[in-house]
């Protein structure tokens, strides 16, 4: 019979012969022959192969370097790579996410417009007139000034973007 020019799915052509690929989680030790099947071996600890393959070496699991603010989100298996994520309170510095950086806080006078995620930093906005923030925070929005009127009080000290208004009693000595 004519030697094959193409092989079925999960096979590969070698020496004019179709050999079975190794299944995910295993690497190739030796090609098949006319008389023997393809020989495969499981990947070692901390190694993986995620496809049907003819690789002679497994890939090393990704290292989630705590030095770069990374931690393990999902431990790798013989068939899957480790998935890294940023430490709590940190976010990726780029799409590649090879390192992370601490979320920023919004300074007094600024409030959180958008809370940081694993891939984006905190977005701050200046507190507009009528609002204030007196803390440095990665979570707190600008708070509205206290309404003295609703408490039957008057403004004794005006508020700023960093301080609330100070309310005081109404002046009862009016003529």
């Amino acid at each position: 019979p004519e030697p094959p020019t193409a092989c079925r799915e999960k096979q590969y052509l070698i020496n004019s012969q179709c050999c079975s690929l190794c299944q995910p989680g295993q690497k190739l030790v030796s090609d098949c022959t006319e008389f023997t099947e393809t020989e495969c071996l499981p990947c070692g600890e901390s190694e993986f192969l995620d496809t049907w393959n003819r690789e002679t070496h497994c890939h090393q699991h990704k290292y989630c370097d705590p030095n770069l603010g990374l931690r393990v989100q999902q431990k790798g298996t013989s068939e899957t790579d480790t998935i890294c994520t940023c430490e709590e309170g940190w976010h990726c510095t780029s799409e590649a996410c090879e390192s992370c950086v601490l979320h920023r806080s919004c300074s007094p006078g600024f409030g959180v417009k958008q809370i940081a995620t694993g891939v984006s930093d905190t977005i701050c906005e200046p507190c507009p007139v009528g609002f204030f923030s007196n803390v440095s925070s990665a979570f707190e929005k600008c708070h509205p000034w206290t309404s003295c009127e609703t408490k039957d009080l008057v403004v004794q000290q005006a508020g700023t973007n960093k301080t609330d208004v100070v309310c005081g009693p109404q002046d009862r000595l009016r003529a």
């Epitope: 770069l68 780029s94 590649a96 090879e98």
Partner: antibody, heavy 115, light 107 residues
């Protein structure tokens, strides 16, 4: 091998500005932040801020806002720090370092402000 | 800003001794603390991060411990090449802040 190569020493007059550089090699420049740290003789270290070369986002220590400006150039894998309105208090060694936890540091740029 | 206080500006030791350098944070920083060694004319060198993790290539005579507000860098079996300045740093919140440093010198 990862390396951060900083520009040479600077002697400048009070009131002037200076721009120092930090050239990165041996890694993908845009995947890691570059932070800057000030060291005055006989004193501790002071964190100035960082730049993320991927997004050009900066984060400054309030104390250095208006004093330091951080920029970067992806094409040359170089981070820059410009210091303005210089006084004798700005005389120090300035270090650039990769990552928030300073894994790799430049050799430092000595700035002397003197008339 | 979080203040990192290194109570000893200088510490005297002898080769072979065990020495502990302390650092106190003005508020809880969890374990977000690093220790650096700096020798004259050199840039700082990372020794410990996340309070107790030894950086690659750092000899195991350097040990970090602590969490919250109290942190310690211990050098067991001090060698002459360990004579240097040691700085703690918090990276729990911005701005990152350093201790004033502890200079390790020979008795």
């Amino acid at each position: 091998e990862f390396q951060l190569q900083q520009s040479g020493p600077e002697l400048v007059k009070p009131g002037a500005s200076v721009k120092m550089s930090c050239k990165a090699s041996g890694y993908t420049f845009t995947n890691y932040i570059i932070q800057w740290v000030k060291k005055q003789p006989g004193q501790g270290l002071e964190w100035i801020g960082y730049i993320n070369p991927y997004s050009s986002e900066t984060n400054y220590n309030e104390k250095f806002k208006g004093k330091a400006t951080l920029t970067s150039d992806k094409s040359s894998s170089t981070a820059y720090m410009e210091l303005s309105s210089l006084t004798s208090e700005d005389s120090a060694i300035y270090f650039c370092a990769r990552d928030l936890i300073g894994n790799y540091w430049g050799q430092g740029t000595t700035l002397t402000v003197s008339s | 800003d979080i203040v990192m206080t290194q109570s000893h500006k200088f510490m005297s030791t002898s080769v072979g001794d065990r020495v502990s350098i302390t650092c106190k944070a003005s508020q809880d920083v969890g374990t977000a603390v690093a220790w650096y060694q700096q020798k004259p004319g050199q840039s700082p060198k990372l020794l410990i991060y996340w309070a107790s993790t030894r950086h690659t290539g750092v000899p195991d005579r350097f040990t970090g411990s602590g969490s919250g507000t109290d942190f310690t860098l211990t050098i067991s079996n001090v060698q002459s090449e360990d004579l240097a300045d040691y700085f703690c740093q918090q990276y729990s919140s911005y701005p990152l802040t350093f201790g004033a440093g502890t200079k390790l010198e020979l008795k």
